[in-house]
């Protein structure tokens, strides 16, 4: 139930967060599950624990395995598992599928590529970006905070993009790379005030307690490529990242689709292991572009199990 997959490359930094949550004041102990050996907290070690984070500085193939984190609350010890796989660096340029993060889509006027997992690291701008192993050069490419912006996107811009940054730990620098695919939707057109196709305004979505639930925020912004169009979810008027509930996550990046020639974006909100308290929250699907912002509110209700009669 409390398990998470993480992966990295040998000789790079890898930082993993405990899947079990807790207050910042709680002690977290880490163990290598196969041997039950405690992970040290002293930073002089190559692999060490730092609260909810497990740090491989740098990682080695032999580090692969399952790590146990135990969050020591005032009452119980709560256990989580991190399944870590460290791969050898490829000699050629191809990035294998098992090292790829989720694919993102863009268009001529909307082309952000976020660098995966970067929030776990102590890094400073700018990021370095590569496409198919070649360093990106030219004024069309702008590294901004934790993402890459490509101006005047063309179909030729599709490909595998790698972000590279330096993690700093007590004055020592470690390289980190992460790769994801970028696809391009190319079409000329016009833009409109956002139209939210789903969810309906004030929609009530039935969910089952204990099960997973997905909410899709889908909006169209006109025809063809769109400039500064976005959809996102808010919880009780707060950004998902600021809300602080790890079970509720937005799908990283935005999927772009073209419905009847219209340029549409969707963002999936994933709620793992729905809890009763999730029904108390207000879920806002926001769609915005240069014309303005439109908001549709959704609430969750408990689905009553259907009686089956023979």
């Amino acid at each position: 139930k409390f398990s998470k997959q993480s992966w990295g490359l040998e000789n790079e930094a890898l930082i993993v967060r405990c899947p079990r949550q807790g207050k910042p004041s709680y002690t977290v102990d880490w163990y290598y599950s196969q041997t039950n050996k405690s992970i040290p907290t002293q930073e002089r070690n190559r692999v060490f624990a730092s609260g909810q984070l497990l740090k491989f500085l740098p990682a080695a193939v032999a580090d692969s395995g399952i790590y146990t984190c135990i969050v020591r609350s005032p009452t119980f010890n709560r256990t989580g598992y991190a399944n870590v796989t460290i791969y050898k660096k490829q000699s050629d340029c191809n990035v294998p599928d098992y090292l790829m993060y989720s694919t993102v889509s863009g268009s001529e006027k909307n082309s952000k590529i976020y660098c995966p997992t970067i929030d776990l690291y102590n890094w400073t701008a700018p990021l370095e970006w590569f496409k198919n192993c070649q360093a990106l050069q030219g004024s069309r490419y702008r590294a901004h905070k934790s993402f890459l912006v490509i101006d005047n996107v063309m179909t030729e811009d599709a490909g595998d993009y790698t972000c590279k940054f330096i993690h700093n730990e007590n004055g020592a620098n470690y390289s980190v790379t992460a790769t994801r695919s970028f696809t391009v939707k190319d079409e000329q057109g016009f833009s409109l005030f956002p139209v939210i196709g789903a969810p309906a305004q004030n929609e009530i979505k039935e969910v089952e307690i204990g099960k997973n639930a997905n909410l899709t925020c889908s909006a169209c912004f006109g025809k063809g490529t769109q400039f500064l169009a976005a959809v996102l979810w808010q919880l009780n008027g707060t950004k998902i990242t600021d809300f602080g509930e790890p079970r509720i996550q937005q799908e990283e990046g935005q999927n772009q689709s073209f419905s009847n020639g219209l340029a549409c974006l969707d963002m999936v909100l994933r709620i793992a292991d729905v809890k009763e308290e999730d029904l108390l929250l207000q879920y806002d699907c926001l769609a915005l572009n240069l014309h303005g912002l439109r908001r549709h509110t959704v609430r969750l209700s408990r689905k009553n199990p259907i009686d089956h009669h023979s």
Epitope: R20, Q21, G22, K23, P74, T75, R78
Partner: antibody, heavy 121, light 106 residues
Framework: QVQLVQSGAEVKKPGASVKVSCKAS????????LHWVRQAPGQGLEWMGT????????VYNQKFKARVTMTADKSTSTAYMELSSLRSEDTAVYYC??????????????WGQGTLVTVSS | EIVMTQSPATLSLSPGERATLSCSVS?????MHWYQQKPGQAPRRLIY???KLASGIPARFSGSGSGTDYTLTISSLEPEDAAVYYC?????????FGGGTKVEIK
């Protein structure tokens, strides 16, 4: 919605035992630690202990350790608190309660209606 | 165990007045939770993690503090705020509550 429904009032003689039940609904029973808090008439709140229904592990307030037993039945989503060797000062309302988000220990957000246990000869 | 001392024991104020309830702790804690209890009812969570307002609680309630001194403030008393208020620590086991402050509305 989250509900914690407790068993009815009990009258016991000194030296006897009492077993109070707390039936949970509206959430996944094994995902949340259940706590027991008591309140003597006109007095404040006193934490007795907690149980993790998933594992059956318990943590008791030292004051009650020798006399209290907390159990959980996953099949019926019911927690139990048994207090033995009752004395008159155990006369109180006994509550079961749980946090809002378990891992954050963010206060007792849900409470049972309370069970009055009267100890009298 | 951590001993929680609430003051004053009783607070008698008029509607619209500001109520300040204190909770002093015998040793430092990271967070404080506050509850409201009316006669014949189970306690109700008001404030959690020192300053966060629980769901459905009016904004006139607020919490603050750190270390060994914490405060619950009711900015403008309403008649329905008459109740006993308890602070509670979840820093170390056993979890402990304050003795309560009774708020009376004149």
């Amino acid at each position: 919605q989250v509900q914690l429904v407790q068993s009815g009032a009990e009258v016991k003689k000194p030296g006897a035992s009492v077993k109070v039940s707390c039936k949970a609904s509206g959430y996944t029973f094994t995902d949340y630690e259940l706590h027991w808090v008591r309140q003597a008439p006109g007095q404040g709140l006193e934490w007795m202990g907690t149980i993790d229904p998933e594992t059956g592990d318990t943590v008791y307030n030292q004051k009650f350790k020798a006399r209290v037993t907390m159990t959980a039945d996953k099949s019926t989503s019911t927690a139990y608190m048994e207090l033995s060797s009752l004395r008159s000062e155990d006369t109180a309302v006994y509550y079961c309660t749980r946090a809002f988000y378990n891992d954050y220990d963010d206060g007792f957000a849900y409470w049972g209606q309370g069970t009055l246990v009267t100890v009298s000869s | 165990e951590i001993v929680m001392t609430q003051s004053p024991a009783t607070l008698s104020l008029s509607p619209g007045e500001r109520a300040t309830l204190s909770c002093s702790v015998s040793s430092s804690v990271s967070y404080m939770h506050w509850y409201q209890q009316k006669p014949g009812q189970a306690p109700r969570r008001l404030i959690y993690d020192t300053s966060k307002l629980a769901s459905g609680i009016p904004a006139r309630f607020s919490g603050s503090g750190s270390g060994t001194d914490y405060t619950l403030t009711i900015s403008s008393l309403e008649p329905e705020d008459a109740a006993v208020y308890y602070c509670q620590q979840w820093n170390t086991s056993p979890l402990t509550f304050g003795g309560g402050t009774k708020v009376e509305i004149k």
